[in-house]
């Protein structure tokens, strides 16, 4: 594998997702090199002239950085020596989505890997019992999603049942005119049953569970990013 006396080194990236309006991380690792001053990290984005970020000789070099990323990027400097070239991206926006390349050059050799960065919005759902309805119903709300997700209900007792006829889902555009609030109401629920509200788009899947008994209401929520790794 020798090229000019240098070898290829293994660089590994993970498809990752950024939640717009938050800081995000583009993950990249490489074979560690104890000589920090000999490590060069370059992040590039397909279709963008100039660099996303450059770190060399133990410090940032932003002289070639593209305007779009000015003031927004950082590597985890203290972790570079152990092979972490991940990039922190401040205030992720939809336009940050795309194909990125993590390029590494060390005293051991050089290598690169591409990363597909997806951007959107995803949030935890909250389920509450809606006592105002004529019959007992459940209201599942999640404040921020993009692209528009699908919403499905499930129940522990009636496994495999289709609840689309007894539920109503609406999407309300948020003030920044990108993300949307998701509201889904499930009607005619029965006591002593566990219901799940599942919200999913191509970036994330979130599930909210609620168990309603005569004496108490128990809730649980979880969120997972899709296509990571």
């Amino acid at each position: 594998f020798g090229i000019s006396g240098k070898h290829f080194i293994t660089v590994t990236t993970f498809t990752s997702a950024g939640n717009i309006g938050e800081d995000g991380t583009l993950s990249c690792t490489f074979e560690p090199d104890i000589k920090l001053n000999g490590i060069v990290i370059q992040w590039l984005k397909e279709g963008i002239k100039g660099l996303v970020h450059e770190f060399k000789e133990g410090k940032d070099d932003l002289s070639q950085q593209h305007e779009m990323f000015r003031g927004r990027t950082a590597v985890f400097a203290d972790q570079v020596v152990v092979g972490n070239a991940s990039l922190r991206l401040k205030n992720v926006q939809l336009t940050d989505a795309g194909t990125y390349t993590c390029y590494i050059h060390t005293s051991k050799g050089k290598g690169n890997a591409n990363l597909e960065y997806k951007t959107g919005a995803f949030s935890m759902p909250e389920i509450n019992v809606d006592y105002n309805a004529s019959s007992e119903s459940l209201r599942c709300e999640a404040p921020r999603w993009f692209p528009q997700p699908t919403v499905a209900w499930a129940s522990q007792v009636d496994q495999g049942a289709n609840f689309s006829e007894v539920s109503n889902t609406s999407f309300e555009l948020n003030s920044e005119n990108v993300t949307m609030k998701v509201v889904s109401v499930l009607y005619n629920v029965t006591i002593n049953n566990t219901y799940s509200c599942m919200i999913e788009n191509d970036i994330a899947k979130a599930t909210g569970d609620i168990k309603v008994t005569d004496s108490e209401v128990k809730r649980r929520s979880q969120l997972e990013l899709l296509n990571s790794g």
């Epitope: 927004r72 205030n91 948020n174």
Partner: antibody
């Protein structure tokens, strides 16, 4: 014109509560990281709280559990709810926008005095 | 927690002179996340430099920023009377999310 205008400061007794407001014009609050920064008399700047574009919040340890940052998107306004106020919370409170490259827009500040 | 230490605490210079203000971080700070502010008495701070070396909108070119890692510098090439103020460096990204230096007072000699 991009502008931030704070209000709601005043004299309050220790243990009391106060809500500061920051009205924004010329830009959309929910698209930026919005902050509260304070400055005690004769002292330097101290970061207090942030609300991200996503709506998630974070605060300095000194105010955690006592101060809550929030926003009303329909009013394009930022708030700081301050509870269990202490003498050391006496300061000028500024709201400031972080437009990805530093706190580029600041309000004129509102003074909070905690004293019995 | 990253601590930013500014030096000197007070700098006494005359108009026309060159001012060099230092900001040292207790651990490495990304150049992208380092900013400088100017504050005059009774006024809100004003952003001067972001990304360690980029001038904010409307800032005269006599102001320049440099440095990386743990050592950053704000330079005012030729002092004007309106430049006498307090200057703060600030970093973003660790806990607490925003940290300011204690400030350097630039006063007329």
């Amino acid at each position: 014109e991009v502008q931030l205008v704070e209000s709601g400061g005043g004299l309050i007794q220790p243990g009391g509560s106060l809500r500061l407001s920051c009205a924004a014009s010329g830009f959309i609050v929910s698209r930026n990281y919005m902050n509260w920064v304070r400055q005690a008399p004769g002292k330097g700047l101290e970061w207090v709280s942030v609300i991200y574009g996503s709506g998630r919040t974070d605060s300095a340890d000194s105010v955690k559990g006592r101060f809550t940052i929030s926003r009303d998107n329909s009013k394009n306004t930022l708030y700081l709810q301050m509870n269990s106020l202490r003498a050391e919370d006496t300061a000028v409170y500024y709201c400031a926008r972080d437009a990805d490259y530093g706190l580029d827009v600041w309000g004129q500040g509102t003074t909070v005095t905690v004293s019995s | 927690e990253i601590v930013l230490t500014q030096s000197p605490g007070t700098l006494s210079l005359s108009p026309g002179e060159r001012a060099t203000l230092s900001c040292r971080a207790s651990q490495s700070v990304s150049s992208s996340y380092l900013a400088w502010y100017q504050q005059k008495p009774g006024q809100a701070p004003r952003l001067l430099i972001y990304g360690a070396s980029s001038r904010a909108t409307g800032i005269p070119d006599r102001f320049s920023g440099s440095g990386s890692g743990t050592d950053f510098t704000l330079t005012i090439s030729r002092l004007e009377p309106e430049d006498f103020a307090v200057y703060y460096c600030q970093q973003y990204g660790s806990s607490p999310l925003y940290t300011f230096g204690q400030g350097t007072k630039l006063e007329i000699k």
